[in-house]
């Protein structure tokens, strides 16, 4: 039978001779050289050689356990004379014995990690891991211990796990954001002579809201014209916050002051500024200075830092309103005046009033816009605003006069305003009634008495309050012995009636009737109009057949016998 123990071979042999492994031996071996030992399997004849006479095995090369920890070979013992095996072919193992020839290697050359600033001591940051290729089952060659070479007193590492934790209280990102920590992994349980490897851990402190907003100055002053419409931005204020991102977001609000209702503050999300805007119309004449208390606050607050104080700050904003010179303001948007058409020149119609709304109350002068009164019918007292006539009026020519009055500040002619004046001319009975048309009528020679031969109508340019009331009559000089009569219908019309039976056209072919038309107004106005009556030959139906044309060439006036 075979006689051997398990073979062990130390790795990384550095001697000049071959490294002795062990001896294959059969109890059949007499020592007379009759047996021949043969080696086969892993590395046989190359890595491992055998003395075929003695069975001594040697390693020809330096071996690395980490490359191959075990070699499996087969041994044979053969009788040289017969060539027959004296022992059954048997498998044996050469185990490579570990030495500490490998340092620990970290899984990453550089680790990156983050941890919130102001974290409690012992807060987990990251775990680093190093591996050692040496044999973990034999000795301490692969027993790794972690330690911190750089990064104290800020961070610590657990020696067995490689867990990095915070080691310092109140680490403040605003003071320092980046840390480079160097961790060593050492084998042999960290003992002297152990091999080591290092890695770098780049740790960034992430922001927490541990800083309130702060105004760089306690007071701000802005000025704005009183004419600024609501929504006008008048100034920007900015509080600074040492935090970043969401933690540095700021909301602005007006918390106090006389300007609480007059101004707004809006937050510019891009610049984190507070924009003070006009909320209501300002009036320099009412208030010239406003004081606001503006607050800047963090909308995202971490309760655990509230002990640091309120996460807000206040500043005083003083807003000064600038005077804008405003034009005079008339007491009315428009004026309606009236005057009788018989008014004498220089008659006062009424007056306008305008006042400078500015606190200075600059005096105002008045004038008529001559483009609206080309004929210079009206004038105005530049001092008191009295409107008066400068020409005679005629309602029948123009009933309404639309003119514009200008008020101008004496100290500042650029400041002026205008107002429309509507002047109504009131009627006076200054026109006589007259015929509505030229009347030329005809009478048949065989006409009967009291026949209506013409209806008369009158017109009057005047416009009496109670309407027209005209009366018609024959002129006194024609009233007696007239061949015709006038019948006043009392409805502003009159009829011409025949007064006799029959007319002779050869005796009198044309009659001229003077008719007096009067109105009923005060003072009474009347006029005389002439009606021409021609005598015509008519058939038995009363249709005119012929009329003399003499009437066309008769002189104006009364014909005899009318």
């Amino acid at each position: 039978s075979w006689m051997w123990n398990q073979f062990f071979l130390l790795e990384e042999y550095t001697g000049s001779d071959y490294q002795y492994v062990g001896k294959l031996h059969s109890d059949q071996d007499r020592g007379d050289g009759s047996l021949k030992y043969i080696l086969s399997g892993d590395g046989a004849g190359d890595l491992f050689i055998i003395n075929e006479n003695t069975g001594d095995i040697q390693a020809t090369k330096r071996l690395d356990r980490e490359e191959k920890p075990v070699y499996i070979l087969r041994a044979q013992a053969i009788n040289r004379r017969t060539g027959r095996p004296v022992e059954p072919e048997s498998e044996f193992i050469i185990k490579i014995h570990d030495i500490n020839d490998n340092e620990p290697i970290f899984t990453k050359e550089v680790y990156t990690a983050t941890v919130p600033e102001m974290s409690d001591v012992g807060t987990f940051v990251v775990q680093v891991t190093a591996t050692d290729a040496d044999d973990p089952t034999y000795g301490n060659s692969a027993k790794v211990v972690y330690s911190i070479l750089q990064g104290q007193p800020y961070f610590s590492v657990e020696s067995e796990t490689g867990i990095i934790k915070t080691a310092l209280l109140n680490m403040d990102r605003e003071n320092r954001e980046q840390y480079q920590v160097v961790i060593q992994a050492k084998d042999m349980g960290g003992q002297m002579g152990g091999l080591s490897g290092t890695t770098t851990v780049n740790i960034t402190l992430t922001d927490v809201n541990d800083n309130p907003p702060r105004f760089p100055q306690s007071t701000y002053q802005f000025k704005t014209p009183e004419s600024s419409p609501p929504g006008t931005p008048i100034g920007r204020i900015k509080a600074s916050d040492a935090d970043v991102g969401e933690n540095a977001e700021i909301e602005y609000s007006i918390t106090d002051g006389e300007g609480l209702d007059m101004f707004d503050v809006i937050t510019d999300q891009e610049t984190q500024e507070g924009i003070i805007t006009v909320k209501k119309l300002l009036d320099f004449e009412k208030k010239k200075v406003y004081t606001l208390k503006v607050e800047a606050s963090n909308p995202h607050v971490e309760p655990r830092f509230l002990y640091l104080g309120p996460f807000k700050d206040s500043a005083t904003v003083r807003i000064v309103v600038e005077d804008v010179d405003e034009p005079p303001v008339f007491s009315k948007l428009a004026y309606i005046l009236q005057i009788r058409e018989d008014a004498q020149i220089n008659t006062t119609i009424g007056s306008v009033t305008a006042q400078d709304p500015d606190a200075a109350r600059n005096p105002v002068k008045y004038s008529v816009d001559r483009h609206t009164d080309m004929d210079r019918i009206f004038n105005i007292d530049s001092g008191n605003g009295s409107i008066f006539t400068s020409k005679l009026l005629d309602r029948e020519t123009l009933l309404w006069h639309n003119i514009t009055v200008i008020a101008t500040e004496i100290n500042n002619p650029k400041q002026s305003s205008r107002v429309p004046l509507y002047i109504k001319v009131l009627d006076v009975n200054d026109n006589a009634p007259e015929f509505a048309e030229f009347y030329e009528t005809f009478v048949c020679e065989k006409a009967k008495a009291d026949q209506l031969i013409q209806t008369l109508r009158a017109v009057d340019k005047d416009d009496p309050y109670s309407g027209h009331q005209f009366s018609f009559s024959l002129a006194p000089e024609a009233a007696s012995g007239s061949n015709f009569t006038i019948q006043d219908n009392k409805d502003n019309t009159a009829g011409i009636l025949t007064r006799k039976n029959g007319y002779n056209r050869h005796e009198m072919s044309t009659y001229l009737l003077p008719v007096v038309i009067s109105d009923n107004d005060y003072p009474v106005q009347s006029s005389t109009g002439t009606v021409t009556v021609r005598v015509c030959a008519c058939d038995h139906h009363g249709n005119m057949q012929s009329c003399h044309a003499e009437a066309l060439i008769h002189p104006t006036g009364l014909s005899t016998g009318a």
Partner: antibody, heavy 122, light 106 residues
Amino acid sequence: EVQLVQSGAEVKKPGASVKVSCKASGYTFTRNFMHWVRQAPGQGLEWMGWIYPGDGETEYNQKFQGRVTITADRSTSTAYMELSSLRSEDTAVYFCARGVYGGFAGGYFDFWGQGTLVTVSS
Amino acid sequence: DIQMTQSPSSLSASVGDRVTITCKASQNIYKNLAWYQQKLGEGPKLLIYDANTLQTGVPSRFSGSGSGTDFTLTISSLQPEDFATYYCQQYYSGWAFGQGTKVEIK
């Protein structure tokens, strides 16, 4: 030429009141802010308040609030500063000064009165 | 409230000297600063406004500079009539004066 002429020196007892006048000429009185500034003996200048003669609006330094009253008479173009409940530390020269900006309650002072010495002594 | 600190509080100089007076504001007042000269028994006289603008009629030897919180009044060549007390004044928010700098003959 702008001129601010102030009333003469006054001697007052503690607890009394004093009224200093400042007559303006050479500009439109109603269009500029009129400020009052005082200067205690050997001391610096201290702003007291302003009035806008156009409409009589005023603003006072908090330190003097309740004790100082500034008024203006437009008909005579005169501004007045009245200080009540006088104490010895109110002994000072009181100046009126025109605010440079018409229609703006800010700015510097371009013309000053010659000053009125008010002495408070028992 | 904004405080104004003037320095020096007094200085001695000779005719022809270059004189510099400084004024510091407790917060940013931009260019809202005026300089005044006051002689004994008189009211102050405006020299400079808006930090560096010379008031009409004031000699060009007076100049002002600065912005924000730090300001300077310079008299390039001191004249006999320049011996007086100088005040700075902020008008950014309300009105406040420095405590004054007395310029005396050396």
